[in-house]
């Protein structure tokens, strides 16, 4: 039985230009994360393998840093980059977890840098 | 046309090293990671290490931990691998690989080296 | 280390025949699976990566299924220059590793 949950950023903004930091956590299970892929709507940005280490997309990988932790640094944002994110979780014995961010880039300086909302993001599939 | 284009043929005693090269060109050397891998005469393939030409950050199959070292040079677009402590079993065609777009396989394979270890 | 099997070892078949290798792995890898065709003194080629995914330029009877432990690579109707050796690779964990191959020759 999964038990996880996902804990995201939930919807964030940030300025065209700058940097954002994507951030998923798993909590509630004791299941054994084995890779993390990060995922802009079907298009691969990086993984994060717990034996092989990172590999970033070469599409993103001058704008795209690993970390910190599980999570992913994207820079030199562009209003292209607005749209949807996900972390998805490969664990075991659990199977996937999949945790989803809105990102909005504004072209204005009043972005506001953080979350949101208050309440994380919870989804999980197998 | 991505191109890797490895040094030539190796005969080495026991106990010695050889150190292998990879020359890239065709796309940009720091974007995709570089692995290598061994098959021996007659044999499988054999994953050995892969390495980020970028940031330098290798990782390792651990049974050739010790005596492997994966290095790139990024004003060349070359990669090598330096085996150590040679011996008989070492015997192998080696192949660097370059990493795909999404994920750990191998896209593109040098036309491998041979390497003889005997005394 | 994550085990790979691949059967069978060998086979024989005519051009026009539909050719089926399987591949099984000793833990759950998902869909991280690639397979690689070889012939004698060249370097391995990629087929199929992520399972199913045909890599640039591989010939549409080629095709990848499966997930978790088991695998196939379905060659419609084989040709002439498909006479080979077949390796699956899973790109999941470290070590990476092969499976020992299938050799495929002429009938």
């Known amino acids: 039985m999964m038990t996880g949950t996902i804990e995201t950023t939930g919807n964030i903004s940030a300025e065209k230009g700058g940097s954002i930091i994507l951030q998923c956590h798993l909590s509630s299970t004791t299941a054994q994360v084995t890779q993390v892929n990060w995922e802009q709507q079907d298009q691969l940005l990086a993984i994060c393998n717990a034996d092989l280490g990172w590999h970033i997309s070469p599409s993103f990988k001058d704008r795209v840093a690993p970390g910190p932790g599980l999570g992913l640094t994207l820079q030199s944002l562009t209003v292209n980059d607005t749209g949807e994110y996900f972390c998805i979780y490969h664990t075991y014995p659990d199977g996937t977890y999949t945790g989803r961010i809105f990102l909005e880039v504004l072209e204005s300086s009043v972005a506001e840098h953080g979350a949101r909302f208050q309440i994380p993001h919870h989804h999980h599939h197998h | 046309e991505v191109q890797l284009v490895q040094s030539g043929a190796e005969v080495k005693k026991p106990g010695a090293s050889v150190k292998v090269s990879c020359k890239a060109s065709g796309y940009t050397f720091t974007n995709y990671y570089m692995h290598w891998v061994r098959q021996a005469p007659g044999q499988g393939l054999e994953w050995m290490g892969r390495?980020?030409?970028?940031?330098?950050?290798?990782k390792y199959n651990e049974k050739f931990k010790s005596r492997v070292t994966i290095t790139v040079d990024k004003l060349s677009s070359t990669a090598y691998m330096e085996l150590s402590s040679l011996r008989s079993e070492d015997t192998a065609v080696y192949y660097c690989?370059?990493?795909?777009?999404?994920?750990?396989?191998?896209?593109?394979w040098g036309q491998g080296t041979t390497v003889t270890v005997s005394s | 280390d994550i085990q790979m099997t691949q059967s069978p070892s060998s086979l024989s078949a005519s051009v026009g025949d539909r050719v089926t290798i399987t591949c099984r792995v000793s833990e759950n890898i998902y869909s991280y699976l690639a397979w690689y065709q070889q012939k004698p003194g060249k370097s391995p080629k990629l087929l199929v990566y992520n399972a199913k995914t045909l890599a640039e330029g591989v010939p549409s009877r080629f095709s990848g299924s499966g997930s978790g432990t088991d695998f196939t690579l379905t060659i419609s109707s084989l040709q002439p220059e498909d006479f080979a050796t077949y390796y699956c690779q899973h790109h999941y964990g470290n070590p990476l590793t092969f499976g020992p191959g299938t050799k495929v020759d002429i009938k």
């Open positions: 690989a370059r990493e795909g777009h999404y994920g750990f396989y191998s896209d593109y």
């Open positions: 390495i980020d030409p970028d940031s330098g950050g290798s």
